[in-house]
Structure formats: C-alpha cells, structure tokens
C-alpha cells in the first residue's frame, strides 16, 4: 500500500521540499504532540460491562518499542448483579496505528513503515443469531 | 527497504536508539486491514453503548481519513431497548501515530504525529460521588 502523493488539484509542491531518493521518503520520528497529556477516563477497563486487561508488547526494533494491547476478560458481559451474562458478547474494538520497523541486513539497517492493529478495549454487543435451516 | 550503513564497528556496536530522521520505503507493510470501520463490523450499532462514526479528513496527514466515534447516548441500552441512565456510555480513546507532511504539502517528507482518537464506546458503571 503506497502513501498517496498529494494531488496537484490540492497543492503545488513547494520549492522548500527536501530532496528524497526515489522509492523512499524522509521521516522525522520526533513525535508531534509527544508530551500531550490527555484526561482519560478513570479505569474504565474494569468498570465496563465488557471489562478488559492490558498487555504490553515490547520490541526493540519497533518504534515505538512499546505497544499496549487489550484483551476482553469474558466471552459474555457483566450484568447488574456482577455475573457474566452469556446472552451478550464482549467484543474487541480495534484501531490501526503506524510504527517504524528496523530491519537488519548484515551490516546494514533499513526502516519500514508498518500498520499495526491495536485492540483498544471492549464493548458489549447483542450477538448475531444465525438460524440454521 | 532503504538500507543505511551501520556504524564502523559493525556488528558489535549497535545503536539501540532510533535515529531522529530515517529514510523509509514508500510501501507500508501491513495486513491489508480494512480501514473503514463501518464495513469491518457493525459493533457500533449492536453495542449496548452504541456510537456514530464521523469522518475526519486531512490531506496533510496519512492516513488522510480517520473515523471518530461519538457515543449516541449518555446512558446504555438495556434489555428492553431503552436508555438506562444508571449506566454510562463512555468513549474508548487511543493515542495513535500518523504521518504529518512536513514541510507542509511536500509529497515525500513526513513527521510522526501522535493524535487521540475515540475508537468506540463501552458501557460502564458510573463513578458515584457522595457529597458531604
């Protein structure tokens, strides 16, 4: 999947664009908004009717090296009595993000952009019932 | 990908940190995941905390289209299909990395940007505040 170039209908390429070898692109990995702190909801992963746990995956050849993945705790959902209700389903909600992958080839290193699918949390849904003839 | 010579001390001396600027291949390695959540699942309609999906488009960003979730209700849908205000629909938010064209409008020069997106909604028991 190639990153689409900006169409001429939108913009003219500025003169100030840096020279880039063919088939590649320049990527500054100093993250914009790196230090922004967002007020996230307090421990919704344990207060949800479809609660989830977090696992941290670590890979030194990936940037960022730490990616957090959620896993739904139950197949069903938690009812008002605190019991699992298997007539409902806990399902994962996923979102794509970009990472930079470092690959070693002998004494050379190359960098590749990669899309990673992150499970962000879980939600409780009514199941789809398939009626078998 | 684009190869870059390692340090003269290769293979013993390895820089564990990523350089500030890298040259990367224009092809993105992925699993060909479907980026339109409306097509990939109907959880947004079937959830007890349903949400709407809003298209956010920015030609200076890759991906240029990101779908933002907005919870439909303040409460959650109960077994009778009514909104139960004793529970709360809350957004599940995630920080993701995208590419920002830098300098602006340049076709092959980008910087990583961290953005906060609401991916979906989940139903939670509210935090009850007891006022003294």
């Amino acid at each position: 999947r190639k990153i689409p170039k900006v169409g001429h209908t939108f913009f003219q390429k500025p003169e100030s664009c840096p020279p880039v070898p063919g088939g590649s692109m320049k990527l500054d990995i100093g993250i914009i908004n790196e230090n922004q702190r967002v007020s996230m909801s307090r421990n919704i992963e344990s207060r949800s009717t479809s609660p989830w746990n977090y696992t941290v995956t670590w890979d030194p050849n990936r940037y960022p090296s730490e990616v957090v993945q959620a896993q739904c705790r139950n197949l069903g959902c938690i009812n008002a009595q605190g019991k699992e209700d298997i007539s409902m389903n806990s399902v994962p909600i996923q979102q794509e993000t970009l990472v930079v992958r470092r690959k070693h080839q002998g004494c050379s290193v190359s960098f590749q952009l990669e899309k990673v699918l992150v499970t962000v949390g879980c939600t409780c849904v009514t199941p789809v019932i398939h009626h078998v003839q | 990908g684009i190869t870059i010579p390692r340090n003269p001390g290769c293979p013993n001396s390895e820089d564990k940190n990523f350089p500030r600027t890298v040259m990367v291949n224009l092809n993105i390695h992925n699993r060909n995941t479907n980026t339109n959540p409306k097509r990939s699942s109907d959880y947004y309609n079937r959830s007890t905390s349903p949400w709407n999906l809003h298209r956010n488009e920015d030609p200076e960003r890759y991906p240029s289209v990101i779908w933002e979730a907005k919870c439909r209700h303040l409460g959650c849908i109960n077994a009778d299909g009514n909104v139960d205000y004793h529970m709360n629909s809350v957004p599940i938010q995630q920080e993701i990395l995208v590419l920002r064209r830098e300098p602006p409008h340049c076709p092959n020069s980008f910087r990583l940007e961290k953005i906060l997106v609401s991916v979906g909604c989940t139903c939670v028991t509210p935090i009850v505040h007891h006022v003294a």
Epitope: M40 | R72, N88, V128
Partner: nanobody, 125 residues
Framework: EVQLVESGGRLVQAGGSLRLPCAAS????????MGWFRQAPGKEREFVAA????????AYADFVRGRFTISRDDARNTVYLHMTSLKPEDTAVYYC??????????????????WGQGTQVTVSS
C-alpha cells in the same frame, strides 16, 4: 482550553419561552458531553440538562423535563438550551459547561472542567 460564552438571558413573562445559546471556542468541544446548570440566588448550582457527544441523546433534571430541550450544532460549535413554559422558579443564572473526560454520571458538577460566565434569566409572574 475551551472558552464558553452564554447569551440569550433576559426578563420574560411566566409561560414564555427563551433559547440560550452557548458558543464554544478553543479545543474541539464535540468530543465530550456538554451540560447546562443553573444557580438561583442563595441556592446551590444545580444540573439542568446534558447532551451526548453525538447529540443523539439528552438527559434532564426532573424539574425541567418536558419543558426544556438541549441540542447541539457542531458546525457552529454551539449548544442550545430551549426553554418553554417558564415559571418564576426558573429564575437563575444559567451556566453552560464542558467536560474534558467522561467517566462518571453526566449530572455531577465536578466532572465539568470548563464553565461560561453565565447568563441571567428572570421569569416574572
């Protein structure tokens, strides 16, 4: 930062109607629920109404249900409180409020981080 500015408050006869707009600027206000509160002289500030992020759902205090309606126009970054069948006891300063996270009940005052300066509504009998 979110800046909120309420307007539309004035003297109105009992049984009359008013529409209070609340214009938001700064951080995108569409990301979280918005609320209206009111404070009568010598009384605590109290919850009036709240609207969900999507605008598809709203919640109301019992004393205004059926008379007041909250709505939002994300294109204009504005939340409205439509007030009908006004009573003298609705006399108060009406405040618009925004929240930056949503993890508790929608009617709890401390969950709202940003407040407007208020607009005075007086209902005469």
């Amino acid at each position: 930062e979110v800046q909120l500015v309420e307007s539309g408050g004035r003297l109105v006869q009992a049984g009359g109607s008013l529409r209070l707009p609340c214009a938001a600027s700064g951080r995108t206000f569409t990301s979280y629920p918005m609320g209206w509160f009111r404070q009568a002289p010598g009384k605590e500030r109290e919850f009036v109404a709240a609207i969900s992020m999507s605008g598809d759902d709203a919640a109301y205090a019992d004393f205004v249900r059926g008379r007041f309606t909250i709505s939002r126009d994300d294109a204009r970054n504005t939340v409205y409180l439509h007030m009908t069948s006004l009573k003298p006891e609705d006399t108060a300063v009406y405040y618009c409020a925004a929240r930056t996270s949503y993890d508790g009940t929608y009617d709890y005052i401390d969950d709202y981080s940003y407040w407007g300066q208020g607009t005075q509504v007086t209902v005469s009998s």
